[in-house]
């Protein structure tokens, strides 16, 4: 339904405080240098326009769009230019055209420093004394390093973190109680920017097609009882509310993903068996938990897949009448029976059987064309299983930071052109997957696995995008999203790259490695390996777990020594001599 | 027992528009996704449109994005199809049709409509 003031009516419904904080997250998120005073500023004068618009939707302005409202405040900031460059340019435009200017110089890997969280007293004393903004400033802070995180979805990671400070902050120890809980809150929020990212990516590379296949085959198989009709409904409206966060419409997504929250509790017994502890939750809460939600049981009596995609002589009629629905149908019934596939892989199944009906409904005899399709299913199921085998059974031997070491090693022969911070985080989020996934019962293994290895080298594509430099990692981005992984993990040691000569500065290392914690020592180390991969990039592993041994060996050393400068001054060359002569 | 009874069909001008209505009754209407299916004069059937009980539109022919509008009115156990920017190809016989889990399983009588200059 239309309404006289758009602002108004989102104010109502979010009412003021998510109003306040998806307001703070979409500035942030389209002016990421801007400090948070300048933006609450700009927060606190959208909320009393918005609040005179409640009063009276006909005064002046309120009729204007939120995009028209939001893309003023922003071309009204002095020194725009100075500071965002040619992002100005995007103020002489007109609504629709400044929103979607704004949203192309979004800024993936936005130069600020990493976000250092506070010791622990110093962090309970600014919440204690101002829990609104301090809770306003984790907002802004997240929002403006990750441009695509989705809004609704950072309004509850917010909540959580005022949960965990005001639990921990009356503790005698709070350190203790803060440090587990916030890296936890943490590791789930990277988690789903990453993921979140990948959606956007999606929707702006492929369209909403493509989207809502993927939202058809996660569903089905989250709701394997629903019908039809009741997954496309579902994956219909799931689309609409991504695409409008991704389109930086924050306010319409996060009212349209309660009210998704709403009618899917209105209607649990049409969707799952499962809903009903999240349906008792307050709305941030109900819409993650539904979002998270366990898959309900399959049905007993499923039919095998054949009979309706195989065996039933309709089959090419039945596509070309209308092949949207028929594809849709494929992908729902195949999906509901697998929740232990990923949907990366579903979706590939999906587009072997269309690509299959386009060839055997052209022929003379098509059931005896596509007769056999499911059994040509099976190297492609076998791939990713092979896969989380392997990579599982690796990470199993070495633990985290040596899984890390074996993918960075691999990462860096396949893409030496790639920069050493690239393929660093790249390598430490890829190895995560073994800590994330491995541990999980057999079933939940590979969709864990390789939708996170998606999600991961979907950010891999969006850095190598903004500067390109590896034409192997170009050609597997610019494929289908679902196709990456296997493009990625293809991909062999790179033989047109020209080695990087020895630097003996990129292995000379000072004191201050000693006082570094412990992540931050690692990707030292990690740094250095890279660095050692691209000079050697045909180094055997037994050669560069020498030199790696040799390096950590001369570090714990030298930081336990008296006088540690001089240690690494005179250890420092002779570790580089030797791991020159190791590699040679 | 099920019923729907199909109008709003006739002769229009290309580029006209028409608003097709299906009356429902003998079933709970709000609980079902309903569709419009159409056959061209010595052609197959092709669907047209499906719409989910709650009115978010699931499907719509390739043929007729953009210019056609699935909508339900459940309080009046109503179907619509609002038809803009008609085209010659466009002449078919238009069923209304109730879906159930996985397929139409009632039809209507069909409306005709004609788009011809």
């Known amino acids: 339904e239309a309404h006289k003031s758009e602002i108004a009516h989102r104010f109502k419904d979010l009412g003021e405080q998510h109003f306040k904080g998806l307001v703070l997250i979409a500035f942030s998120q389209y002016l990421q240098k801007c400090p948070y005073e300048e933006h609450i500023k700009l927060v606190q004068e959208v909320t009393d326009f918005a609040k005179t618009c409640v009063a009276d939707e006909n005064a002046e302005n309120c009729d204007k769009s939120i995009h028209t409202l939001f893309g003023d405040k922003l071309c009204a900031i002095p020194k725009l230019r100075d500071n965002y460059g040619e992002l100005a340019d995007c103020c002489a435009k007109q609504e629709p055209e400044r929103n979607e200017c704004f949203l192309q110089h979004k800024d993936d890997n936005p130069n600020l420093p990493p976000f250092q969280r506070p010791e622990a007293e110093a962090m309970c004393t600014s919440f204690q004394e101002n829990p609104t903004s301090f809770l306003g400033h984790y907002l802004h802070e997240v929002a403006r390093r990750h441009p695509y995180f989705y809004a609704p979805e950072l309004l509850y990671y917010a909540e959580k973190y005022n949960e965990v400070l005001t639990q921990c902050c009356t503790e005698s120890d709070k350190a203790a109680c803060l440090t587990p809980k916030l890296d936890a809150v943490k590791e789930k929020a990277l988690v789903a920017a990453v993921r979140q990212r990948m959606k956007c990516s999606s929707m702006q590379r492929f369209g909403e097609r493509a989207f809502k296949a993927w939202a058809v085959a996660r569903m089905s198989q989250r709701f394997p009882n629903a019908e039809f009709a009741e997954i496309t409904k579902l994956a219909t409206d799931v689309t609409k509310i991504n695409k409008e966060c991704c389109h930086g419409d924050l306010l319409e997504c996060a009212d349209d993903r309660a009210e998704l929250a709403k009618y899917m509790c209105e209607n649990q017994a049409t969707i799952s068996s499962k809903l009903q502890a999240c349906c008792d939750k307050p709305v941030l809460q109900k819409s993650q938990c539904l979002a998270e939600i366990e898959h309900d049981n399959i049905p007993a009596d499923l039919p095998s897949i054949a009979a309706d995609f195989v065996e039933d002589k309709e089959v090419c009629k039945n596509y070309a009448e209308a092949k949207d629905v028929f594809l849709g149908t494929f992908l729902y019934e195949y999906s509901r029976r697998h929740p232990d596939y990923s949907v990366s892989l579903l979706l590939r199944l999906a587009k072997k059987y269309e690509a299959t009906l386009e060839k055997c409904c052209a022929e003379g005899d098509p059931p005896a064309c596509y007769g056999t399709v499911l059994a040509e299913f099976q190297p492609l199921v076998e791939e990713p299983k092979n896969l989380v085998k392997t990579n599982c059974e690796l990470y199993e031997k070495l633990g985290e930071y040596g899984f890390q070491n074996a993918v960075l090693v691999r990462y860096t022969q396949k893409a030496p052109q790639v920069s050493t911070p690239t393929l660093v985080e790249a390598a430490r989020n890829l190895g995560r997957v073994g800590t994330k996934c491995c541990t999980l019962p057999e079933a939940q293994r590979l969709p864990c696995v390789e939708d996170y290895l998606s999600a991961i080298l979907n950010r891999l594509c969006v850095l190598h995008e903004k500067t390109p430099v590896s034409e192997k990692v170009t050609k597997c981005c610019s494929g289908s999203l679902v196709e990456r992984r296997p493009c990625f993990s293809a991909l062999t040691v790179d033989e047109t790259y020209v080695p990087k000569e020895f630097k003996a500065e990129t292995f000379t290392f000072h004191s201050d490695i000693c006082t570094l914690p412990d992540k931050e020592k690692q990707i030292k180390k990690q740094t250095a390996l890279a660095e050692l991969v691209k000079h050697k990039p045909k180094a055997t592993e037994d050669q560069l777990k020498t030199v790696m041994g040799d390096f950590a060996q001369f570090v714990d050393k030298c930081c336990k020594a008296a006088d540690k400068d001089n240690c690494f001054a005179t250890e420092g060359p002779n570790l580089v001599a030797r791991s020159k002569e190791a590699l040679a | 027992e099920v019923q729907l009874l199909e109008s709003g069909g006739g002769l229009v001008q290309p580029g006209g528009s028409l608003r097709l209505s299906c009356a429902a009754s003998g079933f709970t209407f709000n609980h079902y996704t309903m569709g419009w299916v159409r056959q061209a004069p010595g052609k197959g059937l092709e669907w047209v449109s499906l719409?989910?009980?709650?009115?978010?539109?699931?499907y719509y022919a390739d043929s007729v994005k953009g210019r056609f509008t699935i909508s339900r009115d459940n309080s009046k156990n109503t179907l619509y199809l609002q038809m803009n920017s008609l085209r010659a190809e466009d002449t078919a016989v238009y069923y209304c049709?109730?879906?159930?889990?996985?397929?139409?399983?009632?039809w209507g009588q069909g409306t005709l409509v004609t788009v011809s200059s």
């Open positions: 719409i989910h009980p709650s009115g978010t539109v699931i």
């Open positions: 049709a109730k879906w159930s889990s996985r397929a139409f399983d009632y």
